[in-house]
Amino acid sequence: MVPPPENVRMNSVNFKNILQWESPAFAKGNLTFTAQYLSYRIFQDKCMNTTLTECDFSSLSKYGDHTLRVRAEFADEHSDWVNITFCPVDDTIIGPPGMQVEVLADSLHMRFLAPKIENEYETWTMKNVYNSWTYNVQYWKNGTDEKFQITPQYDFEVLRNLEPWTTYCVQVRGFLPDRNKAGEWSEPVCEQTTHDETVPS
């Protein structure tokens, strides 16, 4: 009897949908795996007889529920299928946005870039898919614990009247108010303000 794949889960970030599993202990030899998806009442092969423990399902529609399954195989034997259901638009993790930060005197000027949909060749972003897309920004004085949060209305924001010659750290994440769903925070960007007068151009 061939044991089934273990710890089957979907790892989906920005609609890059990778079904992952672990190979069970099996004394007779090396197992292969077949992963399928349900497409209008019929299961279709996605990865056949692979020795890998993952399979890319990024071509699935972002909308609606999908049933995926994977089994282990050895020679003419195979395990039972292990099924999972997955709805990309609900379940995918929203990766960290990009952020550009520029210091102008006692202000930090920030521009945000929504994460790209991973499996596409064009410039579609997560902001295209989610109508309610907005950003959360948090910032703090470097070396302190107190953090301040703001929700910019646009793809840019300016933090004004900051303390001069002080290092501030900023990070941003995507947020979906209608789903109450937050994305991953970007890595902090830390910049030092200069004096509190406008720099002459």
């Epitope: 998806y37 209008y40 529609s61 972002k62 499996n119 060749y121 064009e122």
Partner: nanobody, 126 residues
Framework: QVQLQESGGGSVQAGGSLRLSCAAS????????MGWFRQAPGKEREAVAA???????SYADSVKGRFTISKDNAKNTLYLQMNSLKPEDTAMYYC????????????????????WGQGTQVTVSS
């Protein structure tokens, strides 16, 4: 909310032609992948033709050289020109859309499209 509405189906003699249309609301055709599928009674739904946002097209072997898929982004309408129709083309024809997808690879499976029309019937008699 994305809505797709097919039209242009009907009855035709073998060797005749039809042009199916699919009008979209709540969605811009230039931003995604589109496809035509069909389903004959007692059979599974199958892909007929697909077009990506970059305009690249692909066809089922059974319709190559006879059917042409196209889209008019200005009118937000998808078309399927069907020539030299055969009785085996008789089916319900469905328009499908997947917003914000690109021309990286042809989408050829029901599960790869998120939005569907209600279908339009095509009947070809011999």
């Amino acid at each position: 909310q994305v809505q797709l509405q097919e039209s242009g189906g009907g009855s035709v003699q073998a060797g005749g032609s039809l042009r199916l249309s699919c009008a979209a609301s709540g969605y811009t055709y230039s931003s995604g992948c589109m496809g035509w599928f069909r389903q004959a009674p007692g059979k599974e739904r199958e892909a007929v033709a697909a077009i990506n946002s970059d305009g690249s097209t692909s066809y089922a072997d059974s319709v190559k050289g006879r059917f042409t898929i196209s889209k008019d982004n200005a009118k937000n309408t998808l078309y399927l020109q069907m020539n030299s129709l055969k009785p085996e083309d008789t089916a319900m024809y469905y328009c499908a859309a997947e917003p914000y997808c690109s021309g990286g690879y042809p989408r050829w499976s029901v599960a790869e499209f998120g939005y569907w029309g209600q279908g339009t019937q095509v009947t070809v008699s011999s």
